[in-house]
């Protein structure tokens, strides 16, 4: 805490400008009006304040807004955002996507901090669901964002938002998450034709049931091994050799290279040797 001291004569700040970098911490506390600071927050980022000086400015805003900052201030926090604690952020009501983008920009290139996680959580809860624009923004800054959500949280994603999801956004998702996302993707892309549908649904297939895989095998999709290896083992096991051959198309010979990895290994063990031999790959059941 900075002690309350009177502002020396002639040092009262009429505006937020570069002259303030020469103020000592106690002078900033005494001579900068909190309301002025709040209205001129956009200037703070252009001024090379020290971390200690930023602490004083944060303290002034905390005193002015004990219940949490208004969005007009939050949007212009800039690097001062890095000084906020998750507890501070929980008091905020952020509703504008522009505000969210501005704060995510400050943290760009870094891993998701507890502050950012809290901010996103507050924002999404405020909106009630993960809409397409929000998802677009979040995955642009954090490609792994979607896979950091629990299956319960993912259930609030509307099918329309699935259009914003890129394949790389699903890289770190586990089967339980894909189980939630796959039916939404199936619904979102249902009006697309065969080949276009497969391109879009491919990344979500780790949540697909056997009957959907059987249906895909009739559509000449040529699934690659990277996708096949992400399929649920329980969904792959009932597939026949002929169905897998149709599903993989020219990629079927890749089964040989993966014959000891799940789910290929488990699938091979379920097949009759005569059927496996028709592939000509030397797979041993």
């Amino acid at each position: 805490e900075v002690e309350k001291t009177a502002c020396p004569s002639g040092k009262k700040a009429p505006e937020i400008d570069e002259s303030l970098i020469f103020y000592k911490k106690w002078e900033l506390e005494a001579c900068v009006d909190a309301a002025l600071l709040a209205t001129q927050m956009d200037r703070v980022n252009a001024i090379p304040f020290t971390y200690e000086q930023l602490d004083v400015l944060k303290h002034k805003l905390d005193e002015l807004y004990p219940q949490g900052y208004p969005e007009s201030v939050i949007q212009h926090l800039g690097y001062l955002f890095l000084k906020m604690s998750p507890e501070d952020i929980r008091k905020w009501n952020v509703t504008s996507l522009e505000t969210l983008k501005a704060l995510l920009e400050v943290n760009k290139g870094h891993e998701m901090s507890p502050q950012v996680a809290t901010l996103i959580d507050r924002f999404v809860k405020g909106r009630g669901q993960l809409d397409k624009d929000t998802l677009d923004t979040l995955t642009a800054f954090y490609p792994g964002y979607l896979c950091s959500l629990s299956p319960e949280e993912l259930s609030s994603v509307p099918p329309s938002s699935i259009w914003a999801v890129r394949p790389q956004d699903l890289d770190t998702c586990d089967p339980r998450q894909l189980d939630v996302l796959y039916p939404k993707a199936r619904l979102a892309f249902q009006n697309m034709n065969g080949s276009e549908y497969f391109v879009k649904i491919q990344s979500f297939l780790g949540g697909a049931p056997t009957e959907d895989l059987k249906a895909l095998s009739q559509q000449n999709v040529s699934m690659d091994l990277a996708t096949f290896m992400k399929l649920r083992t329980d969904a792959v096991l009932p597939l026949t050799v002929a169905e897998v051959q149709k599903l993989l198309g020219p990629h079927v010979e890749g089964l040989k290279a993966e014959e000891r990895h799940r789910p290929v290994r488990d699938w091979i063990l379920r097949q009759r040797q005569d059927d496996l031999d028709t592939l000509g790959l030397g797979l041993q059941g």
Partner: antibody
């Protein structure tokens, strides 16, 4: 540009363990298995085993079963190989190498990690 | 396990000369892969699926063969080709490499 960046050289005592890391960048980590290969000085290459980042499924050359433990951390696109109960026979350069799922060859290799086991 | 025998173990060639090295397999395999390794460096993929050139590999390199007999050819030797060359198979477990052919420049 695809890169596999391995951890630095290690000098360890017999009987101990060591963990080598391999951080991948420049492509989709989960579309490839991560394999590990051993090369003793002046000798050929020996395949140790590989791991599928999607399922954490591992396969090992029987010769290295119990000697090497392979793991991955998908969130950081990093593969690890722990070598246990080290002896002078384990002194070698260890490479991580990327293998596209369904393919039999290694299209990118790490720079190698030199392990020296000596008392 | 499948054993890959490379020959010769060591060879030398003059710049511009044609070079051929072989990889013999004790059991029939579907494909062979070739790698080049220079001293102090990691192996580099040269040829996959027996005869397909890897990305960025000069066209003077070529691979051929089937069953149990495979070869790597350099149509015109260059100084930068001095290295050790390894063949590898992925048809049978465990996956194995040949002992290598060391190619020196005359």
């Amino acid at each position: 540009e695809v890169q596999l960046q391995q951890s630095g050289p290690e000098l360890v005592k017999p009987g101990t363990s060591v963990k080598i890391l391999c951080k991948a960048s420049g492509d989709t980590f989960t579309a490839y298995n991560m394999d590990w290969v051993k090369q003793r000085h002046g000798q050929s290459l020996e395949w140790i085993g590989d791991i599928n980042p999607n399922t954490d499924s591992t396969i090992y050359n029987q010769k290295f079963e119990g000697k090497a433990i392979l793991t991955v951390d998908k969130s950081s696109s990093t593969a690890y190989m722990e070598l246990r109960s080290l002896t002078s026979e384990d002194t070698a350069v260890y490479y991580c190498a990327r293998r596209k799922l369904g393919r039999g060859y290694f299209d990118y290799w790490g720079q190698g990690t030199t392990l020296t086991v000596s008392s | 396990q499948i054993v890959l025998t490379q020959s010769p173990a060591i060879m030398s060639a003059s710049p511009g000369e044609k070079v051929t090295m072989t990889c013999s397999v004790n059991l029939s395999v579907r494909y062979i892969y070739w790698y080049q390794q220079k001293p102090g460096s990691s192996p580099r993929l040269l040829i996959h699926d027996t005869s397909n050139l890897a990305s960025g590999v000069p066209v003077r390199f070529s691979g051929s063969g089937s069953g149990t007999s495979y070869s790597l050819t350099i149509s015109r030797m260059e100084a930068e080709d001095a290295a050790t060359y390894y063949c590898q198979q992925w048809s049978s477990f465990p996956y194995t490499f040949g002992g290598g052919t060391k190619l020196e420049i005359k």
